[in-house]
């Protein structure tokens, strides 16, 4: 025998109290698949969370973070504070990058500058707390008489992955 509940579509639940009739999910609840015996409570985006997508009868709400914070975890389960570029977030708060390291993002930790000499190149632009070193041509190419090199216009630096 076919389970009568299997006929209940997403957005409804199989109501045992009403002869297994398909009833719509109550307000602030949803069912994303058919045949469910209960509806799930909608996620509420409160505090540092803000609503990215409202809850509907067939799908949960989706949250992201208010400005100054970024998402962590599947489905943005946590909001973590941003730091400034040139800083990293330690367990004790935001801290400036040490000499020889940089961070061009508002999250993550400080990354060591590129060592141009390892690829046989020279330093064209020194690094800062916010920017990596820019490597130029190899030192041999900079001998007298070698044509000068114009650095290319900076492209977008690697950025945030969507959560």
């Amino acid at each position: 025998l076919q389970d009568p509940c299997s006929n209940c579509p997403a957005g409804t639940f199989c109501d045992n109290n009403r002869n297994q009739i398909c009833s719509p999910c109550p307000p602030n609840s949803f069912s994303s698949a058919g045949g469910q015996r209960t509806c799930d409570i909608c996620r509420q985006c409160k505090g540092v969370f803000r609503t990215r997508k409202e809850c509907s009868s067939t799908s949960n709400a989706e949250c992201d973070c208010t400005p100054g914070f970024h998402c962590l975890g599947a489905g943005c389960s946590m909001c973590e504070q941003d730091c400034k570029q040139g800083q990293e977030l330690t367990k004790k708060g935001c801290k400036d990058c040490c000499f020889g390291t940089f961070n061009d993002q508002k999250r993550g930790i400080c990354r060591p500058w590129t060592n141009c000499s390892l690829d046989g190149k020279s330093v064209l632009v020194n690094g800062t707390k916010e920017r990596d070193v820019v490597c130029g041509p190899s030192p041999a190419d900079l001998s007298p008489g070698a044509s000068s090199v114009t650095p290319p216009a900076p492209a977008r630096e690697p950025g945030h992955s969507p959560q």
Partner: antibody, heavy 120, light 109 residues
Framework: QVQLVQSGAEVKKPGASVKVSCKAS????????MHWVRQAPGQGLEWMGW????????NYAQKFQGRVTITRDTSISTAYMELSRLRSDDTAVYYC?????????????WGQGTLVTVSS | SYVLTQPPSVSVAPGETARITCGGD??????VHWYQKKPDQAPVLVVY???YRPSGIPERISGSNSGNTATLTLSRVEAGDEADYYC????????????FGGGTQLIIL
Amino acid sequence: QVQLVQSGAEVKKPGASVKVSCKASGYNFSGYYMHWVRQAPGQGLEWMGWINPNSGGTNYAQKFQGRVTITRDTSISTAYMELSRLRSDDTAVYYCAREPGYYGSGLDYWGQGTLVTVSS
Amino acid sequence: SYVLTQPPSVSVAPGETARITCGGDDIGDKRVHWYQKKPDQAPVLVVYEDRYRPSGIPERISGSNSGNTATLTLSRVEAGDEADYYCQVWYSSPDHPGVFGGGTQLIIL
């Protein structure tokens, strides 16, 4: 969807060089650092180095400095790892892996791996 | 020091809880990531930044980190969890930015 597809298996003689490629698709290749990690038979994972595909800036583990070169061709969304002066203990599976957009997080997408066998 | 120490193996019965440790000096000040590695497959990120799961990783996998030890916990272990697990940390040092632990083989009894 994000995909990293690596070149096929290689067999090399000691002293030779090998160049492994990693073609990226499904995202903005220039926007995310690419890392290389290897695993020798019966051994653990070992980080080798990274490249910023946007600038070409690199960093290598000290163990490999002078033998490894990581490059990229942004026009075909491909990163390369070249290892020179190969020894038998360089026999390993070599993986490319994408950093998720900032330094200090886990590597979120990996290539399928390329087996490099070094044998005389 | 840039050494992360893991036990070579951990054995657990199906349905039980497995705990895999990763030791390192003041590792609690770092952000630890965990990868699952099965034979002939690429590693899979299962926990990042101490305790966060990427999409698609089941809730029974969790992580914690304090003091000198980070821990990956797998509850209600299944046969499909049998794999090697590696912890990993990024440093700001130019010579050793990326360091992996030696790996732990999870054996399902």
